[in-house]
Structure formats: structure tokens, C-alpha cells
Interface confidence: low
């Protein structure tokens, strides 16, 4: 048997107790790159975590969050409680958005309504805890013969915050 230590492939480790032979990672462990001296223990998706992808000899398990929670951090390192639209998560739990703010998602913070007057526009549709205001044309545009409304803004993709 040749010395394969420098060329042990992913899914194996260089076992110094066996004349530097590549040995397969034991069950519930993995090595995602070649030439490793040990295999890493597979991540276990327990509690608020659920398994999105099983561990294999060459890649770690990947976790998601159970219903009612969402992932935070790299590789879903934490699960944070969902709130309802119109709420934000505080240290004391989910709280309704204060007047003048909104949250259209189950995560994240309440954000201020758009100030239509900064753009010289008027409020066409009032904001709520769940939805931003809709700005309409400026008062000067509402002269006879002018259109009474602008087309609605395109909907944002889920999970994207306004810029």
C-alpha cells in the first residue's frame, strides 16, 4: 500500500494509526475536503432545527428551522421566532408596530412609512402596521384632466426590504 496521506479524498481521513492510509469517515462524520487528519462530527438538527439535507461522508448536514421560526446567521446557525406581519420581535417577544411604522414580513423590524411629501407627493392610500403608504401624484398634478392616480409600484420580492 502506498502512502496516500497527502491525497486522501473527501469522505476519508488520513489515519496515522494505520500507516497513513485513507480511512473512510465513520458513521455520523464527514470530511468535505481531501487530505484531512480527522473527520468532523455531523451537525445534528434538533430542537427548533430540522434537517434540510442529511449528512454524508463528504458533506455536513444542513438545518432549517421548524414552522414558526426562521433562520439567522451563516448556515442557519440560529433560529429566531416568527412574528406576524405588523409586528417585530423584541426581547419581550412579538410586539405590534408603533404608529407610523410597518412590517410586511414575519421577520425583521418595523420600518417607518414612506414620507410622500419629501417627493412632493400626496398620500393616496394610508399606511397600516402591515403595509407602507401608497404615494399618489403631487397636489399640483390633480388639476382637471390630470390622471387621478399613478400605477401601483411593483410588488417587492418576498424577503427583500425596501432600499
Amino acid at each position: 500500500l502506498q502512502d496516500l496521506c497527502s491525497n486522501c479524498p473527501a469522505g476519508t481521513f488520513c489515519d496515522n494509526n494505520r500507516s497513513q492510509i485513507c480511512s473512510p469517515c465513520p458513521p455520523n462524520s464527514f470530511s468535505s475536503a481531501g487530505g484531512q487528519r480527522t473527520c468532523d462530527i455531523c451537525r445534528q438538527c434538533k430542537g427548533v432545527f430540522k434537517t434540510r439535507k442529511e449528512c454524508s461522508s463528504t458533506s455536513n448536514a444542513e438545518c432549517d428551522c421548524i414552522s414558526g421560526y426562521h433562520c439567522l446567521g451563516a448556515e442557519c446557525s440560529m433560529c429566531e421566532q416568527d412574528c406576524k406581519q405588523g409586528q417585530e420581535l423584541t426581547k419581550k417577544g412579538c410586539k405590534d408596530c408603533c404608529f407610523g411604522t410597518f412590517n410586511d414580513q414575519k421577520r425583521g423590524i418595523c420600518r417607518p412609512w414612506t414620507n410622500c411629501s419629501l417627493d412632493g407627493k400626496s398620500v393616496l392610500v394610508n399606511g397600516t402596521k402591515e403595509r407602507d403608504v401608497v404615494c399618489g401624484p403631487s397636489p399640483a398634478d390633480l388639476s382637471p384632466g390630470a390622471s387621478s392616480a399613478t400605477p401601483p409600484a411593483p410588488a417587492r420580492e418576498p424577503g427583500h426590504s425596501p432600499q
Epitope: 486522501c8 479524498p9 468535505s32 463528504t58
Partner: antibody, heavy 116, light 107 residues
């Protein structure tokens, strides 16, 4: 379901290169696992030739190391075998297969004869 | 390289019989042994890995055992569809190596 299909010429001349393609459906070759070539000689002896892993790293049988190359085309979900300087001893049925801890999915195999 | 030896090239049995196919490794492979079944004109199919773990969908009449250098595939009640070639393979050391095969024939 995961399926593998080998393709390539059935006849190769001695000293030339043997080139085979394995097309994988039902699973992305960049997602996980290692993607192998195995051959079965007349008389049924099986030989593991080597693999390319999901990350692109390769491992070859030392008996073939100077002649073998396994590459891939991730856009087509295919991986390839090239065996150089073939002789009549390379006449065999060539299989591609997926490797986790073991070879759990195999192609149907393609027969290659080396003859002038 | 590790040499995997299947001492019987052929084994003859009758339907309903119990049959054991053996495989010996040239050195300890720490239960990293798989068994494959190959029917005529088909590719090998995985039956057993880690010496005794049955692959998904494999009937429970197939059982693997062994440790160290000696491994056995047992078919508890042979069926006509079990007529096939059986290979052992070690998946502990590279290069991964196969036994020469045992052809199971039905009397």
C-alpha cells in the same frame, strides 16, 4: 430517481485514448457524493478506476494513475473518463456509479473493445 | 492493495435453502465491506454495506456479517430470482477492491 448513463465508442484502437461520458439525471453532481468509473473485465473481475467528487477533487486507482483522467461538465451534469495509451487489456464493460460510503447507483454499462 | 478473496467461484443450491457466500480480506478492513448482486446483462446492485447494513429495498432474507478479515453474505431462503453473481468489496482502503465473484446457481 437518480439515473446514470454511460456513452462512448465501442471500439478503440490500441495506443489511442478511450473517452467515455456519464450523464447523470435526478441529482446534481455538484451537490454531494463522488462520481466513479468502474470496469468489469471478461471473466467478471471488477476494478475501481477512480472518481471525481462533488467538489471537483479526484482520486484514482494507483494502477492507472499515469493513464487516467476524470473530469466533469457541471452545466450538463456529466462526468468523463479518459484512459490513454490503451491496450487489449483495457477491453471491458465500463460502468459509472455514485459513491457515498459505497456504490449505491450504477449505470447500465458500456462495452469497449480495444482492437486494431 | 487489499486483496478480497471469494474462495467459491460457483455455488449450487436449491430454492428454499440457506446459503452462505464468504469473502476474506488480505488484512483487517474494519467491517467496511459491501456486497453486490449482479444478474446477467445488468449492472451490479448494492445489497449490504458496513458488513451488515442492508441497502434500501433489499429483502431481509439477505444478511451480512463478519469483522476483521472474514465476511459472509447469507441468503436465508434462496429464491429463483437470486440466481446471480455476488461480489464483495472493501471500502476501507483506497484503491477500493472487489472479490472475484461467486456465481449462485439454482439446482
Amino acid at each position: 430517481d437518480v439515473q446514470l448513463q454511460e456513452s462512448g465508442p465501442g471500439l478503440v484502437k490500441p495506443s489511442q485514448s478511450l473517452s467515455l461520458t456519464c450523464t447523470v439525471t435526478g441529482y446534481s453532481i455538484t451537490s454531494d457524493y463522488a462520481w466513479n468509473w468502474i470496469r468489469q473485465f471478461p471473466g467478471n473481475r471488477l476494478e475501481w478506476m477512480g472518481y471525481i467528487s462533488y467538489s471537483g477533487s479526484t482520486s484514482y486507482n494507483p494502477s492507472l494513475k499515469s493513464r487516467i483522467s476524470i473530469t466533469r461538465d457541471t452545466s450538463k451534469n456529466q462526468f468523463f473518463l479518459q484512459l490513454n495509451s490503451v491496450t487489449t487489456e483495457d477491453t471491458a464493460t465500463y460502468f459509472c456509479a455514485r459513491w457515498g460510503y459505497v456504490l449505491d447507483y450504477w449505470g447500465q454499462g458500456t462495452s469497449v473493445t480495444v482492437s486494431s | 492493495d487489499i486483496v478480497m478473496t471469494q474462495s467459491h467461484k460457483f455455488m449450487s443450491t436449491s430454492e428454499g435453502d440457506r446459503v452462505s457466500i464468504t469473502c476474506k480480506a488480505s488484512q483487517d478492513v474494519s467491517t467496511a465491506v459491501a456486497w453486490y448482486q449482479q444478474k446477467p446483462g445488468q449492472s451490479p446492485k448494492l445489497l449490504i454495506y458496513w458488513a451488515s447494513t442492508r441497502h434500501t429495498g433489499v429483502p431481509d432474507r439477505f444478511r451480512g456479517s463478519g469483522s476483521g478479515t472474514d465476511y459472509t453474505l447469507t441468503i436465508s431462503s434462496v429464491q429463483a430470482e437470486d440466481l446471480a453473481l455476488y461480489f464483495c468489496q472493501q471500502h476501507y482502503f483506497t484503491p477500493y477492491t472487489f472479490g472475484g465473484g461467486t456465481k449462485l446457481e439454482i439446482k
